[in-house]
């Protein structure tokens, strides 16, 4: 199982470049000891990234504003774009050096050249998900899961900002599926493809799953999907009654799962 705020449930690869990807603990940011970070990377078939591997990834655009363990007990994070709130206005690997106390808690930077997945688990109040490589065309044979996990009682408002997937009548080749639940088994809402923007979706509970799959043939422009938190008191928390339009399969029912 896998995610950003939880290392494994369902699908687990996060921001990734040159085989390097970032991991957080199940409980959130800065909660992995060195031993745990090492174990997480190794369990997933990789290992802690070296400084050189992290720098190579940074040079092709890997930018994460979170300090993480690297090989040999080193801690740092890759900055591509300087900003006042991250990296002290610098670019490069922000290097905290080799830590004497391996019980300190940071995130992890793993290296696995065979990693081909994307997605994660997200507890942020709002976020934009992009198809891998967006705004460039996505690759063949992609499977990505984004698991949204908000506080109990909150709901999720999903909106489609950009949408361009291979079109076929049954959305069998490339598609995005939305589930009104933690996983991609329960609470199926709809399957979407083509280039029409699907209507907004509001969850019934505090969790939602997005699945993106591309087959081994035609690719297209990809997508950007945004979510924001709807608090219980908010008047906008009534889900829209959406109907079947464009190239999407939609189940009008809503399912409460967590």
């Amino acid at each position: 199982w896998g995610f950003k705020n939880g290392i494994f449930h369902n699908s687990i690869w996060l921001e990734q470049a040159a085989g390097v990807y970032h991991r957080e603990a199940r409980a959130g940011r800065y909660k992995l000891t060195y031993a745990e970070a090492k174990a997480v990377c190794e369990f997933e078939g990789g290992r802690l990234a070296t400084y050189k591997q992290l720098e190579a990834a940074r040079k092709i655009g890997f930018h994460v504003c979170a300090a993480g363990w690297m090989a040999k007990g080193r801690v740092g994070y890759p900055i591509v774009k300087p900003g006042p709130n991250c990296g002290f206005g610098k670019t490069g690997i922000i290097d905290y050096g080799i830590r004497l106390n391996r019980s300190e808690r940071w995130d992890a930077y793993c290296y696995n050249p065979h990693a081909k997945e994307c997605g994660g688990v997200f507890t942020d109040p709002k976020r934009i998900f992009k198809s891998p490589g967006f705004p460039n065309e996505y690759d063949d044979n992609q499977v990505c899961y984004w698991h949204i996990r908000l506080k109990y009682g909150q709901r999720i408002h999903l909106s489609f900002l950009d949408f361009d997937l291979e079109h076929d009548p049954g959305c069998l080749a490339d598609y995005v599926e939305i589930y009104d639940s933690y996983d991609d088994v329960h609470g199926f809402v709809g399957r979407y493809c083509g280039d029409e923007l699907p209507e907004d979706i509001i969850s019934t509970g505090n969790v939602m799953t997005l699945k993106f799959l591309s087959d081994a043939s035609v690719t297209a422009g990809g997508f950007q999907i945004k979510y924001v938190t709807v608090d219980p008191a908010s008047k906008s928390s009534q889900a829209k009654n959406t109907s079947t339009t464009g190239n999407k399969k939609f189940l009008p029912g809503r399912f409460s799962h967590l």
Epitope: W1, G2, G6, I12, G28, R105, K151
Partner: antibody
Framework: QVQLQQSGAELARPGASVKLSCKAS????????INWVKQRTGQGLEWIGE????????FYNEKFKGKATLTADRSSSTTYMELRSLTSEDAAVYFC???????????WGQGSTLTVSS | DIVMTQSPSSLSVSAGEKVTMSCKSS????????????LAWYQQKPGQPPKLLIY???TRESGVPERFTGSGSGTDFTLTISSVQAEDLAVYYC?????????FGGGTNLEIK
């Protein structure tokens, strides 16, 4: 040393509520998910839910929604499970367990026995 | 929910014998991202909480004797004890750690003759 110290045995009447506690080391409390698992006498294990005290996220087994409520008190590094509208079906041993950052429970409390009797 | 089914429900063997128990899940526990199975095995002795034996279907937890071996993938898993010892008297549970709600099998009760 990771320790999950659970409250002692409880005797409650049908229809009443009870609150079980699980005290963790500060490190465990803040950095992991704390889970609750039910085991009736001679029966198997049932997962009730998981709470992340660091961010307040809580996830329930649908079966226990309305029956169990998980809360956490940061000041005492203690997680609580309240069970309401008790019936004989709720009589069981309840374990709290820490979920590792890998896919398993790596530390368990000793269990709290709940007896429901009039 | 993912349903975990264990068999047999009980076993009675003599010390030194090899034991195999099965666990089947109603859905695949294979994570497509890292090709790992999110299945764990626990041992529970009378009056004690469960103790982890195996995770990821086949990785032995530190300190667990080598006679315990986990195998399988997808929906079919097996726990093997190569040479049962008297101290292995316990109930053995498999657990889905792939997705919420976490679910356990009904258990296999191992008795020593």
């Amino acid at each position: 040393q990771v320790q999950l110290q659970q409250s002692g045995a409880e005797l409650a009447r049908p229809g009443a509520s009870v609150k079980l506690s699980c005290k963790a080391s500060d490190d465990t409390f803040i950095n992991y998910g704390i889970n609750w698992v039910k085991q009736r006498t001679g029966q198997g294990l049932e997962w009730i839910g998981e709470t992340f005290p660091s961010n307040g996220n809580t996830f329930y087994n649908e079966k226990f929604k309305g029956k169990a409520t998980l809360t956490a008190d940061r000041s005492s590094s203690t997680t609580y499970m309240e069970l309401r509208s008790l019936t004989s079906e709720d009589a069981a041993v309840y374990f709290c367990a820490r979920h590792s950052n890998l896919p398993y429970f790596d530390h368990w409390g000793q269990g709290s026995t709940l007896t429901v009797s009039s | 929910d993912i349903v975990m089914t264990q068999s047999p429900s009980s076993l009675s063997v003599s010390a030194g014998e090899k034991v195999t128990m099965s666990c089947k899940s109603s859905q695949s526990l294979l994570n497509s991202g890292n090709q790992k199975n999110y299945l764990a095995w626990y041992q529970q002795k009378p009056g004690q909480p469960p103790k982890l034996l195996i995770y990821g279907a086949s990785t032995r937890e530190s300190g667990v004797p080598e006679r315990f071996t986990g195998s399988g993938s997808g929906t079919d898993f097996t726990l093997t004890i190569s040479s049962v010892q008297a101290e292995d008297l316990a109930v053995y549970y498999c657990q889905n750690d792939h997705s919420y709600p976490f679910t356990f099998g009904g258990g296999t009760n191992l008795e020593i003759k």
